[in-house]
């Protein structure tokens, strides 16, 4: 049978039928259903939701829907011994205490099991000492403090504002600086957009609102006790002392009302420049310690959270492919939330639910995709991407042989301005072509394509007339698929105007105020942006699963490889003398990129010309496309980060959320001027150039004619 016979309907009609079946009203209904109570990972409520989703996906028509459970390390506050921070006087009396919980939003006063704000996986402890304000606690902030200002954080409690980088990186930096505790807070400069009211009157963060979140530095390991292997019934677990990525000092998050009480008394050094000042009416003095009258007062943390091995549940749904059932296209997003999950994750989960329903409707009419589609509702994403990582560890052999693509589906919105896409270069053309076929939901772009509004509002910095598409970093469930397994991955959501809104993420991120009402009243009353995101995510899955030739363009990888090689070369050339002294050359890398470009070009020509009616040749060409991403995987991984194995992309060592290109070379060059042994340091740069050049060349050769 040809693929069209196997799927019963012509491909064009398939896609239209699928997209036409997606309804904004259903997404709205699903979002409401998913957000009425908290669904914290490891709780009974989240298990019940898993079973509900399993049941509904079966009703929608999937071939099978199973729960996959794992027993992983999670972290919870002590219910009878709350976490808080105090200002204490010289007698040890607590003269101020931070809040024990957030003021509940209207209509949710009687909801039980709202977990109070906490930093997941913080160790227990009651450190007391002087405070040091460390800005965003980025690598460069600690450089400024230690190298320029000569301020020693050793034995101090540091207070850092949320934003710019992943909170786990902040904690790691504070630990390395010798701090004995970390206080994280949301500054209005980052979480209060001018001219907008705070919740419940608008989408800004109120003073009592607090961002929860994990503070791990897992580097892709998954469950801290079972790195590399699934946390199943017969798992061997490490002792807590050997667990991966746990912080060693107490950490606690607070809102800006409480932060003001701590920061208003700060003395010591003035802030080094205006970039260290937020929007509170406080001096933003760095410290250490409080000013004159208050110099005898100290800060004391009271942290009593516990780490517990707890059962989590993924929901895995299968829609079997008619022609290539052994090729998997995966759509996955998490289900667990910190509290109600109005945006994160349920705005994404509601979209996945509607995509499943639409696919199910087509299947009930006799249609099947060419390739198998797997749908996943991941658990424990908020605790370190645990559900997705454990499932991928359990199924790694299948995935590395059969995985075509992974499309992530966390929050559908973080604003309502324009589309935001991060993906492998292999998917650039797919995304461009798809968005040209979709209608823009934006005001002022009626009758225009999504591609047009997106390109106008978020232009590519390199190519005129094209939209910006970003590198994949981490901080979400695509990590294991892309960074560890080398499966082509992408994500899409609606975002804010980054030009005018310079706050980090969205203001109510991971707070109790992330409710259904937040979305319905302020972000997307008509659910038109949710529908657009459903069309983009669903459309990508549809094309990946149903197109006869995989919709990957290897030439786009060639273009970015050249760009990344130029960039890393220019970073290295900031040290011309050392490059000469240690004979550092990038010739091998540029040569490999040139070869990749030529071979990719020839492959693309062959792709146009080959006989698509020959199933063996078709399968061969598709396999070359599928395995190209895999070819960028180094089985040895990156230095000290064995689960980050992609040579072209990795999460930044300084910010998990951001993607870094040629990360091995980048990290070897980072701060190289401060290394005690320059010869060894530049030797490592040379080794990393060698690894990168070899990998690019090896990947290129997978696209050569097979014989």
């Amino acid at each position: 049978k040809s693929s069209n016979e196997a799927t019963n309907i012509t491909p064009k009609h398939n896609m239209k039928a699928f997209l036409d079946e997606l309804k904004a009203e259903n997404i709205k209904k699903f979002l409401y259903n998913f957000t009425q109570i908290p669904h914290l990972a490891g709780t009974e409520q989240n298990f019940q939701l898993a079973k509900q989703i399993q049941s509904q996906w079966k009703e929608f028509g999937l071939d099978s829907v199973e729960l996959a459970h794992y027993d992983v390390l999670l972290s919870y506050p002590n219910k009878t011994h709350p976490n808080y921070i105090s200002i204490i006087n010289e007698d040890g009396n607590e003269i101020f205490n931070t809040s024990l919980f957030e003021p509940p939003p209207p209509g949710y006063e009687n909801v039980s099991d709202i977990v109070p704000p906490f930093s997941a996986f913080s160790p227990q402890g009651m450190p007391e000492g002087d405070l040091v304000y460390v800005n965003y606690a980025r690598t460069e902030d600690f450089f400024k403090l230690e190298r320029d200002m000569k301020i020693n954080c050793s034995g101090k409690i540091v207070i850092a504002r949320y934003g710019k980088v992943f909170r786990g990186n902040k904690v790691k930096n504070a630990q390395l600086a010798g701090a004995k505790g970390v206080i994280l807070y949301s500054d209005p400069a980052d979480y209060f957009a001018p001219g907008v009211k705070s919740y419940p009157d608008g989408w800004n963060l109120p003073g009592g609102g607090v961002q929860r979140g994990n503070i791990l530095n897992l580097n892709g390991a998954g469950d801290p006790l079972t790195p590399g292997y699934p946390a199943n019934e017969y798992a061997y677990r490490r002792g807590i002392a050997e667990a991966v990525g746990l912080p060693s000092i107490p950490v606690h998050p607070i809102g800006y009302y409480d932060a003001q009480k701590l920061l208003e008394k700060m003395g010591g050094s003035a802030p080094p420049d205006s970039s260290w000042r937020g929007s509170l009416k406080v001096p933003y003095n760095v410290g250490p310690g409080f000013t004159g009258n208050f110099s005898t007062q100290k800060v004391k943390m009271h942290i009593h959270s516990t780490n517990e091995v707890t059962r989590i549940y993924n929901v895995i749904g299968t829609l079997r492919g008619a022609v290539e059932p052994d090729r998997y296209v995966i759509l996955g997003g998490h289900r667990d939330s910190w509290v109600f999950g109005g945006i994160d994750p349920q705005s994404g989960a509601a979209v996945v639910h509607e995509i499943v329903r639409s696919f199910g409707t087509l299947k009930k009419e006799g249609w099947r995709p060419r390739r198998t589609i797997l749908f996943a509702s991941w658990d424990a994403e908020e605790f370190g991407l645990l559900g997705s990582t454990e499932w991928a560890e359990e199924n790694s052999r299948l995935l590395q042989e059969r995985g075509v693509a992974y499309i992530n589906a966390d929050s559908s919105i973080e604003g309502n301005y324009t589309l935001r896409v991060d993906c492998t270069p292999l998917m650039y053309s797919l995304v461009h072509n798809l968005t040209k076929e979709l209608k823009s939901p934006d005001e002022g772009f009626e009758g225009k394509s999504l591609y047009e509004s997106w390109t106008k509002k978020s232009p590519s910095p390199e190519f005129s007339g094209m939209p910006r598409i970003s590198k994949l970093g981490s901080g979400n469930d695509f990590e294991v698929f892309f960074q560890r397994l080398g499966i082509a991955s992408g994500r899409a959501r609606y975002t804010k105007n980054w030009e005018t809104n310079k706050f980090s993420g969205y203001p109510l991120y991971h707070s109790v105020y992330e409710t259904y009402e937040l979305v319905e009243k302020f972000y997307d009353p008509m659910f038109k942006y949710h529908l657009t995101v459903a069309q983009v995510r669903g459309g990508m899955v549809f094309e990946l699963a149903n197109s006869i030739v995989l919709p990957f363009d290897c030439r786009d990888y060639a273009v970015v490889l050249r760009k990344y090689a130029d960039k890393i070369y220019s970073i290295s050339m900031k040290h011309p003398q050392e490059m000469k002294t240690y004979s550092v050359s990038f010739d091998s890398l540029f040569s490999a990129v040139k070869n990749f470009t030529e071979i990719a070009s020839k492959f693309s020509e062959r792709l146009q010309d080959f006989d698509k009616s020959n199933p063996i040749v078709l399968r061969m060409m598709n396999d070359q496309l599928m395995f190209l991403e895999r070819a960028f995987i180094d089985p040895l991984g990156l230095p000290d980060r064995p689960f980050y194995r992609h040579v072209i992309y990795a999460p930044s060592s300084h910010n998990k959320y951001a993607g870094e290109s040629f990360p091995g070379i980048y990290d070897a060059l980072f701060d190289i001027e401060s290394k005690v042994d320059p010869s060894k340091a530049w030797g490592e740069v040379k080794r990393q150039i060698y690894v990168a050049a070899f990998t690019v060349q090896a990947a290129a050769e997978t696209l050569s004619e097979v014989a």
Partner: antibody, heavy 126, light 110 residues
Framework: EVQLVESGGGVVQPGRSLRLSCAAS????????MHWVRQAPGKGLEWVAV????????YYADSVKGRFTISRDNSKNTLYLQMNSLRAEDTAVYYC???????????????????WGQGTTVTVSS | QAVLTQPPSASGTPGQRVTISCSGS????????VYWYQLLPGTAPKLLIY???QRPSGVPDRFSGSKSGTSASLAISGLRSEDEADYYC???????????FGTGTKLTVL
């Protein structure tokens, strides 16, 4: 309708105790700081005490420190003022008041009071 | 306990504009928002002005507040007979970790 209703006032001898209650309705009590304010006969308003929305912080006027205790029961939407070692100068109308919250700004001005009860009279006399 | 200083009385004829002053220090008015309350005879205090110069809904725009340094003032334009009441300013006092009221001003509409 947002409402605060005080109760528990009365005549009491010096040195004795009294507990005032303030029942709140029509708003999310758990989300607001609450104050007690008093007005002695023929005098002006005097702030007495404040408690944060979660009960984690309590502050008192010097004139009542060590004698009065402010508390709240969020499950009952009720604010309390336990008054011990009462003195003649504690004679006043006692008001409970809700801390004002302004959603258009982010400065924590320890906002004033936007909703007041009708007051309950406490008379300390031998 | 520190208090904010107000004139004991003020007066005006209907339609006139009157101003009530409130003087404090750097630890109260100087570093915190000022609030104004109206006490009509036999009723509970009513919030008139918050955050120095903001009016709650339902308060006529005849009432306006301002703050400069360690002083604040309440202006009432188009004076009406129902404005006859006691007026109190108030602010948080950082040195007390508490709240202070003004001495109060009795406004008479002549």
């Amino acid at each position: 309708e947002v409402q605060l209703v005080e109760s528990g006032g009365g005549v009491v001898q010096p040195g004795r105790s009294l507990r005032l209650s303030c029942a709140a309705s029509g708003f999310t009590f758990t989300s607001y700081g609450m104050h007690w304010v008093r007005q002695a006969p023929g005098k002006g308003l005097e702030w007495v005490a404040v408690i944060s929305y979660d009960g984690s912080n309590k502050y008192y006027a010097d004139s009542v420190k060590g004698r009065f205790t402010i508390s709240r029961d969020n499950s009952k939407n009720t604010l309390y003022l336990q008054m011990n070692s009462l003195r003649a100068e504690d004679t006043a109308v006692y008001y409970c008041a809700r801390e004002h919250y302004d959603s258009s700004g982010y400065y924590h001005g320890y906002y004033g009071m936007d909703v007041w009860g009708q007051g309950t009279t406490v008379t300390v006399s031998s | 306990q520190a208090v904010l200083t107000q004139p004991p009385s003020a007066s005006g004829t209907p339609g006139q504009r009157v101003t009530i002053s409130c003087s404090g220090s750097s630890s109260n008015i100087g570093s915190n928002y000022v609030y104004w309350y109206q006490l009509l005879p036999g009723t509970a205090p009513k919030l008139l002005i918050y955050s120095n110069n903001q009016r709650p809904s339902g308060v006529p725009d005849r009432f306006s507040g301002s703050k400069s340094g360690t002083s604040a003032s309440l202006a009432i334009s188009g004076l009406r007979s129902e404005d006859e009441a006691d007026y109190y300013c108030a602010a948080r006092d950082d040195s007390l970790s508490g709240y202070v009221f003004g001495t109060g001003t009795k406004l008479t509409v002549l």
